[in-house]
């Protein structure tokens, strides 16, 4: 679709005469007749195919028209058209004498008629005018002519439509040649599709507007390159959406079981070795002059009642020192210079020489002990406490200070590790001696009953086209990540233009 | 052939929400070629588009109903849904889901059957 | 808002060409789709992109687009084509039908 223009400039006839040599009267009131069609080699009466155009009277004999003349013509005059150009056309432009009023063909004597021009040719669309001008032996017509597009046509011919657009079927201009030219943030056949932030992941995400980044199911982070770990994940990361992978020291469906106590809490303290011996269980190994579950209790060296016959013991900061009684000497007061003649033996003991009465050795009545029968037994040194118990000494009593898993006077019971439920998802709990053991229902194993071995909900294959299936281990359901180019749940439906006319 | 089909409550009381449902079958309705609307047509008068959807979840509604109306996709059903809450007797009608073709320049090549929501207590 | 016009009715006799106008602010800056309803039924698309025709769409119905009017032509117009007929074009980003023109073949 188009326009043939022709620009009428200047029109002579200084005789003021019609074709047939006849002068007007009183002079040539001249209007125009024009006729476009096709390409004819000899240009011929006949129907004027492209279309016909006439003008009102423009001057008498002589005159110039001007651009957009006055008396209701249009100047250039318009020829449209509604096909594609072709390139080729013969013009006939008529010039008459209007007698009267009226400027119909049938109004006017056939002898009205002042000159006729025909010409034939090329014709390319575009801007530029190009100038001609026709002589005969009584006029002369200067004029111009060029073929446009209408508006929203364009090309060679004018036969490509586009209309500029920018709502959501399009966002786009109009180049020379009538293809697209979308707008920045735009991409696609028509510019509809828009174009993500730049490093948005192109299969985990999408964007509805430019510069967008939208994360597909299982994807977060302002690029969608982050997975998203199992829901409920505490201390454990994911390379592909709901894992749970644990970091160090965690076990467990959701990584929240410590099985490194140690380093999370560092339970020992004054410098002992701590020992993982289970999930929140551990053991602190003490450094020396340290006792305590925690080794958290500082030991006297004096506690172990070094000094014998009677010597008194004094701790030092570098270990202790005994102050032996009269008759005793050495590191421990081990040494006597005494014999049974002193009566070394307290408490009842019996005196007995040894060496030809060099020496001696006193023999103690029940609850009494030491080289000279100075102590009172010490309870704790038949080592009551069974299971690793602490004995402390109490007075006239002693206590076992048990460790964990075990109880009673003497840390002879052992608690039942089943006390605490430890087995998850409805498990049942076995006590044995050296700890406890898990029966899980279906669907799970592990010490615990923690690992979910439920059925794989991806074992069937559910995702298409490549698709990458995972199991979302708290619904037992899956979930599909879609290669480029695919959508919907299972990754079935490709994304792309249609064909165009699916009837 | 594609095919849309509408479906959804008949009867609503005033005030409350009219929700209507269009399955797709015969294609995808996740491709990005298409937007996929809902347009109604009073008893006796003409039609009125409401708004439109994509694959993605891009909305587009009438001004004149923006405040009114919610449509979204279910790329898994291959279903789009319209929910237009306070409804009144003006909003008695027959409604339609479409196809709005990028390629036919938004163009509607297909329609469901349309379905009668009459608005009444 | 944006608004399209019909003339409420068009009559034609049968072989005859009806002309349908829709107009608009600068309708031909927009692409023109025109759809038939017949009583009962859903509507068909007959014209998009201002002039061209859906396959199974006869040659007889035609349209144009340019200026602030936009026209669908039946040529030798028959009596199943008796139906509304509905102008629609795209405001932005808002889908605006025209009021409908009742053809009917005498």
């Known amino acids: 679709s188009g326009v043939f223009q022709l620009q009428l400039q200047e029109f002579i006839n200084e005789r003021g005469v019609l074709a047939s040599g006849r002068p007007c009267e009183p002079g040539c009131r001249t209007f125009f007749r024009v006729c476009l069609k096709h390409f004819q080699a000899v240009v011929s009466p006949g129907p004027c195919t492209f279309g016909t155009v006439s003008t009102p009277v423009l001057g008498t004999n002589s005159f110039a028209v001007r651009d957009d003349s006055s008396g209701g013509g249009r100047n250039p005059l318009q020829l449209p058209f509604n096909f594609t150009w072709p390139g080729t056309f013969s013009l006939i432009i008529e010039a008459w004498h209007a007698p009267g009023d009226d400027l119909r063909p049938e109004a006017l004597p056939p002898d009205a008629l002042i000159s006729k021009i025909a010409i034939q040719g090329s014709l390319a669309v575009g801007q530029n005018w190009l100038l001609d001008e026709q002589t005969s032996t009584l006029t002369r017509l200067r004029y111009s002519y060029r073929v446009i597009c209408s508006d929203n046509y364009y090309g060679d011919n004018c036969s490509r439509l586009c209309k500029k657009r920018n709502d959501h079927f399009g966002h786009y201009v109009c180049q020379p040649d009538g293809n697209l030219s979308c707008l920045p943030g735009w991409t696609g056949e028509y510019c509809q599709q828009p174009i993500c932030l730049s490093g948005c992941h192109e299969q985990n995400g999408y964007c509805s507007k430019p510069a967008e980044c939208l994360c597909r199911p299982g994807w977060q982070g302002r690029l969608c390159n982050e997975c998203i770990p199992h829901n409920g994940c505490r201390h454990g990361t994911c390379s592909t959406p709901w894992q749970c992978t644990c970091d160090e020291g965690w076990g467990g469906l959701f990584c929240d079981q410590d099985l490194n106590y140690c380093t999370h809490h560092s339970p020992c303290k004054n410098g002992a070795t701590c020992s993982n011996s289970g999930q929140r269980s551990y053991t602190c190994t003490c450094r020396p002059g340290y006792t305590g579950v925690d080794c958290e209790l500082e030991l006297s060296e004096c506690d172990s009642n070094p000094c014998r016959n009677g010597g008194s013991c004094k701790d030092q900061e570098d270990g202790y020192h005994c102050l032996c009684p009269p008759g005793y000497y050495g590191l421990h007061c081990e040494h006597s210079t005494l014999s049974c003649a002193d009566s070394p033996c307290f408490n009842g003991g019996s005196c007995r020489e040894r060496n030809q009465g060099a020496n001696y050795a006193c023999e103690c009545p029940p609850n009494f002990t030491g080289s000279n029968c100075e102590k009172k037994v010490d309870r704790c040194t038949s080592n009551p406490c069974a299971n690793g118990g602490q004995c402390l000494n109490r007075g006239p009593s002693r206590m076992c200070r048990c460790r964990p898993g075990f109880t009673g006077t003497y840390c002879e019971l052992h608690v039942s590790d089943c006390a605490r439920n430890p087995c998850a998802h409805g498990g049942t709990c076995h006590d044995l001696e050296n700890g406890l053991m898990c029966t899980c229902p279906a669907g799970f194993s592990g010490r615990r009953c923690e690992v979910r071995t439920s059925i794989d909900a991806c074992a069937s294959s559910p995702c298409f086209n490549r698709a990458t299936c995972y199991t979302d281990l708290s619904t037992d359901t899956f979930v599909c990540n879609c290669p480029y180019g695919f959508v919907g749940s299972r990754c079935e439906f490709p994304v792309g233009l249609p064909p165009s006319f699916p009837w | 052939e594609v095919q849309l089909q509408e479906s959804g409550p008949g009867l609503v009381k005033p005030s409350e929400t009219l929700s209507l449902t269009c399955t797709v079958s015969?294609?995808?309705?996740?491709?990005?070629?298409?937007?996929w609307g809902w347009i109604r047509q009073p008893p006796g008068k003409g039609l009125e588009w409401i708004g439109d959807?994509?694959?993605?979840?891009?909305?587009y509604y009438n001004p004149s109903l923006k405040s009114r109306v919610t449509i979204s996709v279910d790329t898994s059903k291959n279903q789009f849904s319209l929910k237009l809450s306070s409804v009144t007797a003006a909003d008695t009608a027959v409604y339609y889901c479409a196809r709005e073709d990028v390629i036919l320049r938004g163009g509607s090549d297909y329609w469901g059957q349309g379905t009668l929501v009459t608005v009444s207590s | 808002s944006y608004e399209l016009t019909q003339p409420p009715s068009v009559s034609v006799s049968p072989g005859q060409t009806a002309s349908i106008t829709c107009s608009g602010q600068r309708l031909g800056d927009k692409y023109a789709s025109w759809y038939q309803q017949k009583p009962g039924q859903s509507p068909v698309l007959v014209i998009y992109e201002d002039s061209k025709r859906p396959s199974g769409i006869p040659e007889r119905f035609s349209g144009s687009n340019s200026g602030d009017t936009a026209t669908l032509t039946i040529s030798g117009t028959q009596p199943m084509d008796e139906a509304d007929y509905y102008c629609?074009?795209?405001?932005?980003?808002?889908?605006?039908f025209g009021y409908g023109t009742k053809v009917t073949v005498l």
């Open positions: 015969g294609g995808s309705i996740s491709s990005s070629g298409y937007y």
């Open positions: 629609q074009a795209w405001d932005r980003d808002t889908g605006v």
């Open positions: 959807i994509n694959y993605a979840g891009s909305t």
